[in-house]
Interface confidence: low
C-alpha cells in the first residue's frame, strides 16, 4: 500500500525518497513518474537523475535536497487538484530486477481558510524556497521571492535544513529509503 502525503491547492507538495549511496557521490540513477511504478522504468517521467546529475525535469518538479547524498525527494510546486494521484520513485540499482520502487500517494485538498492546523504524520507544507549556505556553523537561510538562474544543487527547503541539522554526515531513513552497498 502507498504511503499517503497531503497538500493543499497552491502549496508545494513534498514526496520523500532516499537512498544511501555506497560512497558519497557514487550515485544511482533515479526516476520519478506520475502513476504507479511499472515493471521497468517510470511511466510519465517528470524528473530523472543519472550517475552525475539531474538530467531531465519538467516544470514545477524539482529535487529540494542534496541528491548527491541520496536525497531524491520530489517537490511539486504550486499544486492543483490535478496533481493528486500516485507517484513512483524508482531507484535504478544496477543489475537485473534490482530496482527499488516506491509508490507514494499524493492527496490534494482544496485550500481552506486557516483553521487551527494539525500536524500530520506525513506533514507536507508550503515552505518558502530557501537558498542555503552551509558552513561549519548553523546553516543560514534566506527566503527568496523567486529563483531565476539558481543551480539545482543550491536549492533547498526548510525540510532539508531539518534533516541536515540532525547529523551532518548521516542520511536519515524515510518513508522511501534504501541503502546501497
Amino acid at each position: 500500500s502507498e504511503v499517503e502525503y497531503r497538500a493543499e491547492v497552491g502549496q508545494n507538495a513534498y514526496l520523500p525518497c532516499f537512498y544511501t549511496p555506497a560512497a558519497p557521490g557514487n550515485l544511482v540513477p533515479v526516476c520519478w513518474g506520475k502513476g504507479a511504478c511499472p515493471v521497468f522504468e517510470c511511466g510519465n517521467v517528470v524528473l530523472r537523475t543519472d550517475e552525475r546529475d539531474v538530467n531531465y525535469w519538467t516544470s514545477r518538479y524539482w529535487l529540494n535536497g542534496d541528491f548527491r547524498k541520496g536525497d531524491v525527494s520530489l517537490t511539486i510546486e504550486n499544486v492543483t487538484l490535478a496533481d493528486s494521484g500516485i507517484y513512483c520513485c524508482r531507484i535504478q540499482i544496477p543489475g537485473i530486477m534490482n530496482d527499488e520502487k516506491f509508490n507514494l500517494k499524493l492527496v490534494i485538498k482544496p485550500a481552506k481558510v486557516t483553521p487551527a492546523p494539525t500536524r500530520q504524520r506525513d506533514f507536507t507544507a508550503a515552505f518558502p524556497r530557501m537558498l542555503t549556505t552551509r558552513g561549519h556553523g548553523p546553516a543560514e537561510t534566506q527566503t527568496l521571492g523567486s529563483l531565476p538562474d539558481i543551480n539545482l544543487t543550491q536549492i533547498s527547503t526548510l525540510a532539508n535544513e531539518l534533516r541536515d541539522s540532525r547529523l551532518a554526515n548521516d542520511l536519515r531513513d524515510s518513508g522511501a529509503t534504501i541503502r546501497i552497498g
Partner: antibody, heavy 121, light 107 residues
C-alpha cells in the same frame, strides 16, 4: 550546545493547574518539533503532546486532550505545557524533547532533565 | 494506536555478553523506530533512529535492525555503563508510542 531545560513542576491538588516551560538553547525551536513525554514513577515513557512552533501544528495524546495545551514562543525559544484539570494519574516526571517536523524522522535527539509533577490532595 | 511490544521486560547479563532486545509493532511502521537508553533518575538518550542508524556519539557496539514489523536492538559486547533500561518507540503515526521497556541488569 543544544540544551532543553524544563521548569514549573510541583505539587498540585486534583483539579488544579500547572504550566510547564521548556527553555531551549543552541537551536531555533521554529525549525523543529518540541515534544512533551512523561514518565510515571516506576513506569515507562508516554508521549503527551507536540508542537511544531514554526507552523503552529499541535498534537495530543487522547489521555490529555481537552485538558492540556501545548504552545510555544519562538521569540523566547521556549515551549509550554499548560495542564488543567489535573488528575492523580498525571503524576509523573515531564520531559521536553526535540524532534523533527517530518514524522518519519521524528525521533528525539535532545531531552531536558525533566520536572516532577505530583497531583495529590 | 500502534502497540510496540517489547521483549524481554528484563534480562540479566554479564560484561562482554551479546544482548538482543526486540520490539514488535502491531502494524506497519516502516523504518520509523527509535531506541533509547535510560538510566535511573536521568532522561532517555537516543541510541538508534530510523530503525538502523546509529546516533552521533553512540558507541558502535549498539546496532539496530528491522525485519518487517520486528525491530531489534543489539549490544554486541555489553559494557558496565550499558546496564540501564531500553525503550523502543515508533514515530510513524500519531500518537507516537513506546515499548514498555527492557531492564538490563548485571548477572
Amino acid at each position: 550546545e543544544v540544551q532543553l531545560v524544563e521548569s514549573g513542576g510541583g505539587l498540585v491538588q486534583p483539579g488544579g493547574s500547572l504550566r510547564l516551560s521548556c527553555a531551549a538553547s543552541g537551536f531555533n525551536i521554529g525549525n523543529y518539533a518540541i515534544h512533551w513525554v512523561r514518565q510515571a514513577p516506576g513506569k515507562g515513557l508516554e508521549w503527551v503532546a507536540d508542537i511544531t512552533p514554526g507552523q503552529g501544528y499541535t498534537e495530543y495524546a487522547d489521555s490529555v486532550k481537552d485538558r492540556f495545551t501545548i504552545s510555544a514562543d519562538t521569540s523566547k525559544n521556549t515551549a509550554y505545557l499548560q495542564m488543567n484539570s489535573l488528575r492523580a494519574e498525571d503524576t509523573a516526571v515531564y520531559y521536553c524533547a526535540r524532534g523533527y517536523v517530518y514524522r518519519m524522522w521524528d525521533s528525539y535527539d535532545y531531552w531536558g532533565q525533566g520536572t516532577l509533577v505530583t497531583v495529590s490532595s | 494506536d500502534i502497540q510496540m511490544t517489547q521483549s524481554p521486560s528484563s534480562l540479566s547479563a554479564s560484561v562482554g555478553d551479546r544482548v538482543t532486545i526486540t520490539c514488535r509493532a502491531s502494524q506497519d511502521v516502516n523504518t520509523a523506530v527509535a531506541w533509547y537508553q535510560q538510566k535511573p533518575g536521568k532522561a532517555p538518550k537516543l541510541l538508534i533512529y530510523s530503525a538502523s542508524f546509529l546516533y552521533s556519539g553512540v558507541p558502535s557496539r549498539f546496532s539496530g535492525s528491522r525485519s518487517g514489523t520486528d525491530f531489534t536492538l543489539t549490544i554486541s559486547s555489553l559494557q558496565p555503563e550499558d546496564f540501564a533500561t531500553y525503550y523502543c518507540q515508533q514515530h510513524y503515526t500519531t500518537p507516537p508510542t513506546f515499548g514498555q521497556g527492557t531492564k538490563v541488569e548485571i548477572k
